[in-house]
């Protein structure tokens, strides 16, 4: 028999439960897992269904982003009486399976992570045999991933007037606070920019006006660290020559 | 870089305990699973025990199950098994390793080891 | 629970091609792992989920498997790759990893 699940109530330990009589769909998530860039972390995920003993065809799935239409980052298929999961998709191959599905366990394990996989995950699971069914986590588990400051660009820029300025661009969770130091500035937060529209990890600031030669260093830093970069004006006859 | 470095080797007598530590650096500890296996003198590679990344499930090889006890410590980084009323043919090399796989997975970095003698 | 039973030995010239065999009922349902032991030494991940090798493993080790039989296959053998070898299975009804009994590899 198909059914597809629409209606779900969650509580606060984001468990998703769907009921009807003597049929029991259910999904265990933690609302968040942290941990730093560079790092593994496990997404746990562990459900209960109402088919018993089902040994036919599974397939686990996990997404990112959004419910049953964010991209796929991990999927596998056990065959009929089969415990083993052989995994088909892992993006970049960093994802990979720690529950056993046949043990109700979807668990997974992201590993060498990046800024870039801070989003929401969302764990399923498909039924193909007699039973037709599947399930999935619709509020997901929010993966929290934390970095230390990298400063990814910084250079010095033309302005009107035969000036110059430099702009300072550092990413990292929290977003840090840039600071710049230089000839006569002592050390400034010099016109800092919110974190750009759809990079909430990048921050931006900028010394709108470099009025004397010399070392311009910018330093970004957060509660997991620091980091230092510098560029270099020269004038020579309106020209200027930067280095980082 | 993945680093497992083993201790509490020694010559124990039989019926006696002996506690194994692997402490683990260069990687998340915490989301691996983790195991031990053994090598009897001249023998082949005999897998003991694993713990999962969280230490909820634990499994042994009938030959230790009930005498020995592996558990983990995620904020130390450290693996341990405690063995209890040891016997002649406990004595091995003891090897703990990460397991890199999914839940079926292989042993990706092993420990260097440490020699197990049960003896009166 | 799973039995996996390898040759005690295998000889092979160098340069030649050796294959260790693993055997195993309908072994071809489950991932098989091969490791290399070398005297002295803790073992060393050479093949994993049958065919697949880690990085810093030379292309000349390859492996395959299906039926009841796996086979880890080393081409253009050298006198380094003597040591012993073995196969390595996760059987699920016990949650236990097995291993096969160990092959020793000897480059003549």
């Known amino acids: 028999f198909v059914r597809t699940k629409i209606d779900t109530t969650e509580n606060l330990l984001n468990t998703e439960v769907h009921s009807s009589p003597a049929q029991r769909w259910s999904m265990q998530v933690p609302p968040e897992v942290s941990a730093e860039a560079g790092d593994a972390a496990v997404l746990p995920c562990t459900f209960t269904h109402p088919h018993r003993h089902y040994d036919g065809p599974l397939t686990a799935i996990w997404r990112a982003g959004e419910p049953y239409a964010g991209p796929q980052v991990f999927r596998c298929a056990a065959a009929r009486g089969s415990e083993l999961c052989q995994t088909a998709l892992s993006l970049h191959g960093r994802f990979r399976l720690l529950g056993n599905p046949r043990r109700n366990d979807l668990s997974l394990r992201v590993e060498r992570l990046a800024l870039a996989d801070d989003r929401r995950y969302f764990c399923r699971v498909e039924f193909a045999g007699d039973v037709h069914d599947r399930y999935e986590s619709r509020h997901g588990v929010r993966l929290h991933v934390t970095a230390a400051p990298r400063i990814v660009n910084i250079s010095v820029l033309p302005s009107p007037a035969h000036a110059f300025r430099a702009l300072c661009t550092a990413e990292g969770e929290p977003p840090p606070a840039l600071a710049w130091s230089g000839p006569a500035l002592g050390n400034s937060l010099a016109a800092v920019r919110s974190p750009r529209e759809g990079h909430g990890h990048l921050v931006t600031a900028e010394l709108p006006a470099l009025t004397h030669d010399g070392r311009y260093t910018c330093t970004a830093a957060n509660s997991l660290g620091r980091s230092e970069a510098s560029v270099y004006l020269f004038r020579f006859h309106g020209a200027s020559g930067a280095s980082t | 870089q993945v680093q497992l470095v083993q201790s509490g080797g020694g010559v124990v007598q039989p019926g006696r305990s002996l506690r194994l530590s692997c402490a683990a650096s260069?990687?998340?500890?915490?989301?691996?699973?983790m195991h031990w296996v053994r090598q009897a003198p001249g023998k082949g590679l005999e897998w003991v025990a694993v713990?999962?990344?969280?230490?909820?499930?634990?499994y042994y090889a009938d030959s230790v199950k009930g005498r020995f006890t592996i558990s983990r410590d995620n904020s130390k980084n450290t693996l341990y098994l405690q063995m209890n009323s040891l016997r002649a043919e406990d004595t091995a090399v003891y090897y703990c390793?990460?397991?890199?796989?999914?839940?079926?997975?292989?042993?990706?970095?092993w420990g260097q080891g440490t020699l197990v003698t049960v003896s009166s | 629970q799973s039995v996996l039973t390898q040759p005690p030995s295998v000889s092979v010239a160098p340069g030649k091609t050796a294959r260790i065999t693993c055997g195993g009922n309908?072994?071809?349902?489950?991932?098989v792992h091969w490791y290399q032991q070398k005297p002295g030494q803790a073992p060393v991940l050479v093949i994993y989920?049958?065919?697949d090798r880690p990085s810093g493993i030379p292309e000349r080790f390859s492996g395959s498997n299906s039926g009841n039989t796996a086979t880890l296959t080393i081409s253009r053998v050298e006198a380094g790759d003597e040591a012993d070898y073995y196969c390595?299975?996760?059987?699920?009804?016990?949650?236990?990893?097995?291993f096969g009994g160990g092959t020793k590899l000897t480059v003549l």
């Open positions: 713990i999962s990344y969280d230490g909820s499930n634990k």
């Open positions: 989920d049958d065919s």
């Open positions: 309908n072994i071809g349902s489950k991932s």
């Open positions: 260069g990687f998340t500890f915490s989301s691996y699973a």
């Open positions: 390793a990460r397991e890199g796989g999914s839940y079926y997975g292989y042993f990706d970095y």
């Open positions: 390595q299975v996760w059987d699920s009804s016990s949650d236990h990893r097995v």
